[in-house]
């Protein structure tokens, strides 16, 4: 049975085997087409989600679709039901928390009272002044908290207590990529991890340990990538994996927060990378133990210089490393998180590509997660 499962796939009606390599090849080899059903699927970017959260204390903003203008949500008459609607619009199914925060002196958006219309937040028509003088600070999910804070050093062995959202994504029991838990159902990773194997069956996620071999595997229900961009083939290196059963959170299994839409990190901002990838370029061997390293944001202009990536780093990517080189992600780290700590940990980047590992002028290039929030929310909403 194990051999059969490894090399063959069973079609139904009539029952017969086809070679596993015919799965997800774009051809209907089973009479009912089930060999093309459980495959990596692409999902378009979709319409603009009409709510978003700002890095200014996670305050809620609402889009007026008629004018294309964004407004800050006033706390007046804001209810739990409205909070749930806002989070559902972003695809969250968990119970949100919200509080009032004072309107700051730098408030640049108009502040309006919020109401609901057919399960979408709307601005109240006769919205007068914001009497409470407060904005809505909204959290759709408790995320980005770990049991242990890492020390700031070069590269060292990591503990799952520091990074409870880190997972190993495996094909046929072999580690292929890293990934990050975003909520009980969803793991964030890189699209290029699935280039070779587009059938969902053999992909598994392992969570809750910093040792590669030692944790139970979780079945995957769906793998969703964003539509390919034929003008910028290295863009859109992002994927979402939906787990068959929701995760139970614990001290070693927890979600990381998505970034805020306006999370613009300045050069030299400290960041963290983790993974089980190669410890040296062309080193040929994964690390059995999770490794962590502190890096920093590298200016895109510097990263695109003639002695570096020569314009290949787009606005939907970001660079991170250390100016002198030597600390970087490598093969096997792909899909893992590039993390920023404010009040909570946020996944600001996804390990994507680079020339070599650790070179001084060619740092790691990461998918900029804030550029894909709209896509993530649309995928989640479609799967609610």
């Amino acid at each position: 049975k194990v051999i059969l499962d490894k090399y063959y796939f069973l079609c139904g009606q009539p029952l017969h085997f086809i070679p596993r390599k015919q799965l997800c090849d774009g051809e209907l080899d089973c009479p009912l087409g089930e060999d093309e059903e459980h495959c990596v699927k692409s999902f378009p970017e979709g319409p603009a989600v009409a709510v978003r959260l700002s890095k200014d204390r996670s305050t809620l903003q609402v889009l007026d679709s008629a004018t294309g203008n964004w407004f800050s949500a006033c706390f007046d008459n804001f209810t739990e039901a409205l909070a749930e609607t806002a989070c559902r619009q972003m695809g969250y199914s968990s119970k949100p928390t919200f509080r009032a925060v004072e309107i700051g002196p730098d408030q640049d958006l108009d502040v309006v009272e919020i109401t609901e219309n057919s399960q979408e937040l709307r601005m109240r028509n006769s919205s007068g002044p914001c009497l409470s003088g407060s904005l809505v600070s909204l959290h759709c999910l408790a995320c980005g908290k770990s049991l242990k804070t890492p020390r700031v050093v070069g590269v060292e062995e990591a503990s799952v207590d520091s990074w409870p959202w880190q997972v190993s994504i495996q094909y046929d029991k072999q580690h292929v990529c890293g990934g990050s838990i975003l909520d009980p159902h969803w793991v964030l990773t890189a699209a290029h991890c699935f280039r070779k194997h587009t059938d969902v069956f053999n992909w598994k996620v392992r969570a809750g340990s910093d040792k590669l071999g030692s944790f139970p595997s979780l079945a995957v229900a769906k793998i969703i990538i964003i539509e390919f961009n034929p003008m910028y083939p290295k863009d859109n290196d992002i994927a979402l994996m939906k787990l068959q059963f929701p995760l139970t959170f614990s001290g070693t299994v927890r979600p990381i927060c998505l970034p805020f839409f306006d999370e613009e990190l300045t050069p030299a901002t400290p960041l963290w990378i983790i993974g089980w990838g190669f410890t040296k370029q062309n080193g040929g061997k994964m690390s059995d133990i999770l490794l962590q390293a502190s890096v920093q944001v590298i200016d895109s202009t510097r990263c695109n210089a003639d002695d570096a990536y020569q314009g290949e780093v787009t606005e939907k990517m970001m660079c991170a490393g250390i100016p002198e080189g030597g600390v970087d992600t490598c093969q096997g780290d792909s899909g893992g998180p590039l993390m920023y700590q404010s009040d909570q940990w946020h996944v600001v980047g996804i390990v994507s590509w680079g020339y070599g590992c650790g070179g001084p002028s060619t740092p790691g290039v990461y998918t900029k997660v804030s550029a894909y929030l709209n896509w993530i929310y649309n995928v989640w909403k479609a799967e609610l």
Partner: antibody
Framework: QVQLVQSGAEVKKPGASVKVSCKAS????????MHWVRQAPGQGLEWMGW????????GYAQKFQGRVTMTRDTSTSTVYMELSSLRSEDTAVYYC????????????WGQGTLVTVSS | DIQMTQSPSSLSASVGDRVTITCRAS??????LAWYQQKPGKAPKLLIY???SLESGVPSRFSGSGSGTDFTLTISSLQPEDFATYYC?????????FGPGTKVDIK
């Protein structure tokens, strides 16, 4: 030097198919994406689809889905674009165009192939 | 699909003039914009990519600017060989789309 040389002009009847070729030289054929763009007489440019000559993967504009097929022959460094169920509005000059190595624009174009669809 | 509009649709200018062509996207496209020049009976030629990067071999009198929804192609001093039609193209979202073109002819 980089060259994209396309096949000659074609006259086709409505309902027929046409296959246009584009032979690449002067660079590593499998290292660059190839796209097809068409231009009806006196009109603007219309993107049709792309092909990765290395993997053979393709993607087409919704408008042409089901009617267009892009293929390649790596032994001759040639890409092909076949358009079926031709109608008079398919009369156009068809261009193959190479995507810049780092993306963002088409740096080399074929000379164009005029396809005329007429009964 | 993202719609691209160009203005003006045509313009008449003299050699030595400074010429500006604008391109507008129906939604934000960052800097994912290219400009092409096409002469009658010829294939288009890439001038600018990533909104403002000059393609190698293109004269420095051509420049591009803009980000988001509004973009500009500027020819600082029009030369006889610059009389042609100019197209913008977005590469931000599938499918790539072109503007309708701006024809620059001799005054």
């Amino acid at each position: 030097q980089v060259q994209l040389v396309q096949s000659g002009a074609e006259v086709k009847k409505p309902g027929a198919s046409v296959k246009v070729s584009c032979k690449a030289s002067g660079y590593t054929f499998t290292g660059y994406y190839m796209h097809w763009v068409r231009q009806a007489p006196g009109q603007g440019l219309e993107w049709m689809g792309w092909m990765n000559p290395n993997s053979g993967n393709t993607g087409y504009a919704q408008k042409f889905q089901g009617r267009v097929t892009m293929t390649r022959d790596t032994s001759t460094s040639t890409v092909y674009m076949e358009l079926s169920s031709l109608r008079s509005e398919d009369t156009a000059v068809y261009y193959c165009a190479r995507l810049r190595a780092k993306g963002g624009g088409f740096d080399y174009w074929g000379q164009g192939t005029l396809v005329t669809v007429s009964s | 699909d993202i719609q691209m509009t160009q203005s003006p649709s045509s313009l008449s200018a003299s050699v030595g003039d400074r010429v500006t062509i604008t391109c507008r996207a129906s939604q934000g496209i960052g800097n994912y914009l290219a400009w092409y020049q096409q002469k009658p009976g010829k294939a288009p030629k890439l001038l600018i990519y990533a909104a403002s990067s000059l393609e190698s071999g293109v004269p420095s009198r051509f420049s591009g600017s803009g980000s988001g929804t509004d973009f500009t192609l500027t020819i600082s001093s029009l030369q006889p060989e610059d009389f042609a039609t100019y197209y913008c193209q977005q590469g931000y979202r599938f499918p790539p789309t072109f503007g309708p073109g701006t024809k620059v002819d001799i005054k």
